[in-house]
Interface confidence: low
């Protein structure tokens, strides 16, 4: 067979679907690899071909599109399962070709079982809600294209195992679930079950997502440096170990990158010759506020090191702060017999 541009196995798009539910899977070629869409390809005389490799097998096989009730079908660039079975798990390939052109990509499809409380090995998307922020909504995800707009499905929402009805601050509104005032107690897994008819059959779509209640932007502040501060002086003798913690509190900010770093005499530790190590630890509050600690350590400090400027810097999308540590050389304690005695007028 002639050469084909093979994009390999696209593990970035590990598709998981529930057993015994409809699934529509778009050929990733048009979304991620090629510069044109299916309509353009089709009108240019290119044909889309599907085949698959079963789980734990090496043999590529054509997909059987002649199953009872058209259980597996193809429509434009979409592969349909109505519904899926557990043994549909495998690597699926879509290939676009004509006599002079060929391009293909494979992707893994995993059919997953769920229990009666919607627990499963499915990787769940996380939706973050701001704490005490007013009305916020989540929407039942990935249900577009399963039924025409003329079909009115029924949607039932669950928190964990429990159907959501008469909840204090959570109200189902069709495809949306509204949180009147999000609280920490609203953390958890929420499931929408969409039921719709098609050709005399009834199908269910189950979609679960994790809700995480996080700090509100109303309360967000620039980074706060707790240490170093003006109350602590790092007083050392040459030869001792110098340890200075930089502890910074960051409010939760959606999509913000929090940064903490030290400078020594205005330079990054990597840019200077002294033997310095920096260890970082990170902890989070229940609302995902973050505390970062970077400990600057010089094993055997010299008198030169004790004259340097040690500055902790912190930055988030809210702003930037910096604080210099107070470092000084310890004055040796006087030896009583000589210095103090002299002070008392002894000769």
């Amino acid at each position: 067979s002639e050469r084909c541009d093979d994009w390999g196995l696209d593990t970035m798009r590990q598709i998981q679907v529930f057993e015994d539910e409809p699934a529509r899977i778009k050929c990733p070629l048009f979304e991620h690899f090629l510069k044109f869409n299916y309509s353009t390809a089709h009108s240019a005389g290119l044909t889309l071909i599907w085949y698959w490799t079963r789980q734990d097998r090496d043999l590529e096989e054509p997909i059987n599109f002649r199953l009872p009730e058209n259980r597996i079908s193809k429509e434009k660039d979409v592969l349909w399962f109505r519904p899926t079975l557990l043994n549909d798990t495998g690597n699926y390939t879509c290939m676009l070709r004509n006599t002079t052109y060929c391009s293909k990509v494979a992707f893994p499809l995993e059919v997953v079982q769920k229990d009666s409380c919607f627990n499963s090995p499915m990787k769940l998307p996380v939706h973050k809600l701001y704490i005490e922020y007013g009305i916020q909504r989540i929407t039942c995800p990935n249900v577009d294209g399963y039924f025409p707009s003329s079909v009115k499905p029924t949607i039932t929402w669950y928190m964990g195992c429990y159907k959501i009805q008469n909840f204090n601050n959570v109200i189902p509104e069709g495809m949306n679930l509204s949180f009147l005032i999000a609280l920490i107690s609203n953390n958890g897994n929420y499931t929408c079950v969409v039921t719709y008819p098609e050709n005399g059959r009834t199908f269910h779509l189950t979609r679960t997502l994790t809700v995480k209640v996080v700090g509100s932007p109303k309360n967000a502040v620039p980074p706060v440096i707790h240490s170093p501060n003006d109350h602590v002086v790092y007083e050392k003798e040459p030869g001792e170990e110098l340890l200075i913690p930089c502890t910074v509190y960051f409010s939760f900010l959606m999509d913000s990158r929090n940064e903490v770093w030290w400078t020594i005499d205005g330079k990054k530790p990597d840019d200077i010759t002294i033997d310095v190590t920096i260890n970082e630890s990170i902890s989070h509050s229940r609302t995902e506020d973050e505390t970062r600690t970077q400990i600057l350590s010089i094993k055997k400090v010299t008198s030169e090191d004790l004259k340097r400027s040690y500055v902790c810097h912190a930055r988030s999308a809210k702003g930037e702060v910096a604080k210099a540590a107070k470092v000084k050389q310890k004055v040796p304690a006087p030896r009583y017999t000589v210095e103090l005695a002299c002070g008392f007028g002894a000769t």
């Epitope: 999509d255 940064e259 702003g319 930037e320 910096a322």
Partner: antibody, heavy 119, light 113 residues
Amino acid sequence: SLEESGGDLVKPGASLTLTCTASGISFSSSDFMCWVRQAPGKGLEWIACIYAGSSVSIYYATWAKGRFTISKASSTTVTLQMASLTVADTATYFCARSTGSVGRGFNLWGQGTLVTVSS
Amino acid sequence: AQVLTQTPSPVSAAVGGTVTISCQASQSVYNSNHLSWYQQKPGQPPRLLIYSASTLASGVPSRFKGSGSGTQFTLTISGVQSDDAATYYCQGEFSCVSADCIAFGGGTEVVVK
């Protein structure tokens, strides 16, 4: 507005201090005050920034470290000290401000001051 | 050091036409969106057009549009006017932890015919 001053014709090896003065405004604690230069007929080149809220937050372009020093002289003045000048430092030097949250770009620029290094 | 590569230069456009300038960063800008666009005319300082990759600066006409994230950004000028003839620069803000915080692209000259 921002106004740069101190530009001059100097010989290679000389030092020079440029001053950026704000009129009608004073630098707020969330302002980044920066120096950017532009050689004749060339593009913009970042030199250094100082975070007005904390005079220890100072950033330099790698090439500028050691020869250039940015400092905040007052609530309305930022300076750039330049040492060991070479012909390659000939440029218009702009003072620029980025205000508010980080990532807002430089929304206020001075007209620039010309530094010419020539023997 | 961070590098911002602008293409193409120069670019020529007819009045009423559309100009697209791209800016590619050697590594992701801070928070994926800390990229600004400037317009500069001869003898003048730069003027901020776009910040945070896509937010229009105050007083800038809506025919200027910024898009992109991470390392790939675009400035689009639609309905080009003769007054848009200038050099356009992208400017990225990067993590200050590892390297230079700020870098400018090399500039793209826009000629309006």
